[in-house]
């Protein structure tokens, strides 16, 4: 049935591991190594094994992976063909490289986090181990011949001569049975003869399709070729014991002459094309740290030279139900903080000779956006913001507040859900942005939640640079400069003129430019100029000036 894509296109249900080999390869029994888990913050380690038919259940000690608790995957059962999506419209080809990049958002791509990976610890460096792959069952190549004698079935009267011949890989067996049926219908067996004929196949015929597994010894750096046959064969020059040809050098051809007493000359001449040494390949994590939260990059690296023909080396990866045939793969649009399993193998002339299984945990993702509950000014110099934290892991908050072109940012503890802003400027619009961040392989900032408020009004500051000048005997010209801080919505200048303690003039203008006429001559006057912002008056600027005697 079709996998149901999640919002990202990748299902998150538990999955059975799918055996990688998709070719009818010569190699039969292959045991996958335990899946080695690697966290990208740790030194990269991997388990790769050459393929041994005996090595069907390799255990990994938890101690070998930083004393991590064992991560068990159970019951890898029968494998279904990956379900494939319906062909969409052809896409425009781009310049091809040898790197496979696949976005998990494609229809029906099934790249499942490994079982149990939804409850992932926040602790970087956590590791886990996984159980081994099951071994592919070996299909027996023999045919069982069953002959039923003494049948007493009630059949129409007739005589039948039946000859049954079965060919096995060991010998030709002729079974001839003559059964005569009487007119009454009862069966009478007159003769029964089973004879083996001495004719044998040639060893060249018998072992025409022999397959081989290459087993690598990391100490000696030599291969053993295991011949997949059902009987103990003999090799010319005694080159094999127990169907194994030992001490084969990488990238060298070896010729083996195979014979057995069940077959005749000519012998089978088997050319062993020995693969490169296993340790010359290393599975490398090529993920860019900036993208490690949603991408996985894996690449086989040749870390030493060898003389084998690189054209004969092929690489395979399987991640979920996606199969790749490149040396390097990139998977995109993955879930952060999830473990994904990829199996890979390298083949030489279609013989598997090494493989690795990786469980890769994607990095912490960018935290989600905090949800602002309210954001307002409660006084002229104060504001308050409250919020709910994002769901995803994060380390701290950054709160920035911007007035006009000025920006101030604060680092806030992850446990805070409210912050009081102090020392704000009155009657000023503040734009606030709040985002969570996490320090992972790199710092990842979550989306910022935004809000704004305008602080309350306050008294404006004093006008300045006030001047009083006489324009005639009984007239004065009063000017001043606007206050530095208006602190309110409106703009109005007031002038009060007092003689003694008596208010003689009270004027209001849009600008601080007053012409005061018809004053009394030779009188002391007090001039008070102040700014009013619609809510509050400012501190007055006070100057004293006297009119002169009339000149007339």
């Amino acid at each position: 049935q079709s996998p149901t894509p999640s919002p990202t296109g990748l299902t998150t249900a538990k999955m059975p591991s799918v055996p990688l080999s998709s070719d009818p390869l010569p190699t039969h029994t292959t045991a996958f190594s335990p899946a080695s888990t690697f966290e990208r913050e740790n030194d990269f380690s991997e388990t790769t094994t050459s393929l041994s038919p005996d090595n069907t259940s390799t255990q990994v000690s938890p101690d070998s992976l930083d004393n991590a608790s064992a991560f068990n995957t159970t019951g890898v059962s029968s494998v279904q063909t990956p379900h494939l999506p319906t062909h969409a419209d052809s896409q425009t080809p781009s310049a091809g490289t040898d790197t496979q990049t696949f976005s998990g958002s494609a229809a029906n791509a099934k790249l499942n986090p490994t079982p149990g990976s939804n409850a992932i610890s926040d602790v970087p460096g956590e590791r886990s181990t996984a159980s081994t792959f099951p071994t592919d069952p070996v299909s027996p190549l023999t045919t069982t011949l069953s002959l039923a004698h003494h049948s007493s079935a009630a059949l129409p009267a007739r005589t039948s001569n039946t000859t049954i011949t079965a060919n096995t890989s060991d010998a030709y067996l002729n079974a001839s049975e003559t059964t005569t049926l009487s007119p009454s219908g009862s069966a009478v067996i007159s003769t029964t003869t089973i004879a083996t004929t001495p004719s044998k196949p040639t060893c060249d015929e018998k072992y025409a399709n022999i397959t081989v597994d290459y087993l690598y010894n990391k100490e000696t750096k030599l291969f053993t070729a295991k011949l997949n046959v059902n009987e103990n064969v003999e090799c010319g020059n005694n080159t094999c014991t127990n169907n194994e040809v030992h001490n084969l050098t990488e990238c060298k051809n070896a010729s083996v002459s195979i014979s057995h007493n069940s077959c005749t000359a000519p012998d089978k001449t088997l050319i062993l094309d020995v693969p490169p040494g296993v340790e010359k390949f290393q599975l490398h994590d090529c993920t860019q740290v900036e993208k490690a939260d949603t991408t996985i990059c894996l690449k086989w690296k040749n870390i030493e030279t060898f003389t084998c023909d690189t054209q004969n080396i092929t690489y395979r990866f399987q991640c979920g139900n996606m199969i790749f045939d490149n040396k390097e793969i990139k998977l995109e649009n993955l879930e952060p903080e999830h473990e994904y399993k990829c199996d890979s193998e390298i083949l030489y002339n279609n013989h598997k000779f090494t493989n690795a299984s990786k469980i890769i945990k994607t990095d912490f993702g960018s935290p989600g956006e905090p949800q602002i509950i309210f954001c307002r000014s409660e006084a002229a110099h104060q504001g308050v913001i409250t919020w709910n934290p994002p769901q995803r892991s994060f380390h701290n908050f950054t709160l920035c507040y911007i007035k006009e072109t000025e920006k101030d940012c604060l680092n806030l503890d992850k446990n805070l859900i409210k912050y009081d802003l102090q020392n704000l400027k009155p009657y000023t619009k503040y734009v606030l942005s709040l985002h969570a961040y996490i320090i992972a392989k790199v710092q990842r900032n979550g989306s910022a939640a935004m809000c704004h408020f305008t602080t309350k009004s306050a008294p404006p500051s004093q006008v300045w640079n006030m001047t009083v000048s006489m324009t005639s005997d009984n007239s004065m010209h009063v000017k001043c400069r606007p206050p530095r801080d208006r602190n309110g919505p409106h703009e109005r200048y007031h002038l009060e003129v007092e003689a003694g303690n008596t208010l003689v003039r009270n004027e209001s203008h849009k600008n601080c430019d007053f012409r005061v006429k018809d004053l009394q001559y030779s009188t002391d006057y007090t001039f008070k100029a102040y700014f009013h912002n619609g809510d509050y008056p400012g501190e007055p600027f006070i100057l004293h000036h006297s009119t002169s005697y009339n000149s007339k």
């Epitope: 494939l84 319906t86 062909h87 490289t97």
Partner: nanobody, 126 residues
Framework: EVQLVESGGGLVQAGDSLRLSCAAS????????LAWFRQAPGKEREFVAS?????????HYGDSVKGRFTISRDNGKNTVALQMNNLKPEDTAVYFC??????????????????WGQGTQVTISS
């Protein structure tokens, strides 16, 4: 202009063999993959086999055809063949040849392929 033309389909008995051929023209990039997909009536398109055009033996098969089908290439003639042995009634489908010039997606997904042939009908009678 890229063209893929399939041939070799037909009606055969269960257990028989059939060989399909796909002639590719207009593909200039040697880095490409050719594949066979099939689609039975009322079913989704299914991956059958793929082969890389350059390099060593790099072939893949769908689980249902492993051991029975063999994909091969003839670079000189620009053709890809699918040898189908021991055919079963469930192999009845329209077989499509496909080519990918961007090797940036899983080889067993039809969305990974850029060019498609018209298809050839294969019918297996029991």
């Amino acid at each position: 202009e890229v063209q893929l033309v399939e041939s070799g389909g037909g009606l055969v008995q269960a257990g028989d063999s059939l060989r399909l051929s796909c002639a590719a023209s207009g593909l200039t990039n040697p880095e490409r993959r050719l594949a066979w997909f099939r689609q039975a009536p009322g079913k989704e398109r299914e991956f059958v086999a793929s082969i890389r055009w350059s390099g060593g033996p790099n072939t893949h098969y769908g689980d249902s055809v492993k051991g029975r089908f063999t994909i091969s290439r003839d670079n000189g003639k620009n053709t890809v063949a699918l040898q189908m042995n021991n055919l079963k009634p469930e192999d009845t489908a329209v077989y499509f040849c496909a080519a990918a010039v961007r090797l940036t997606a899983p080889l067993n997904f039809d969305t990974s392929y850029d060019y498609w042939g018209q298809g050839t009908q294969v019918t297996i009678s029991s």
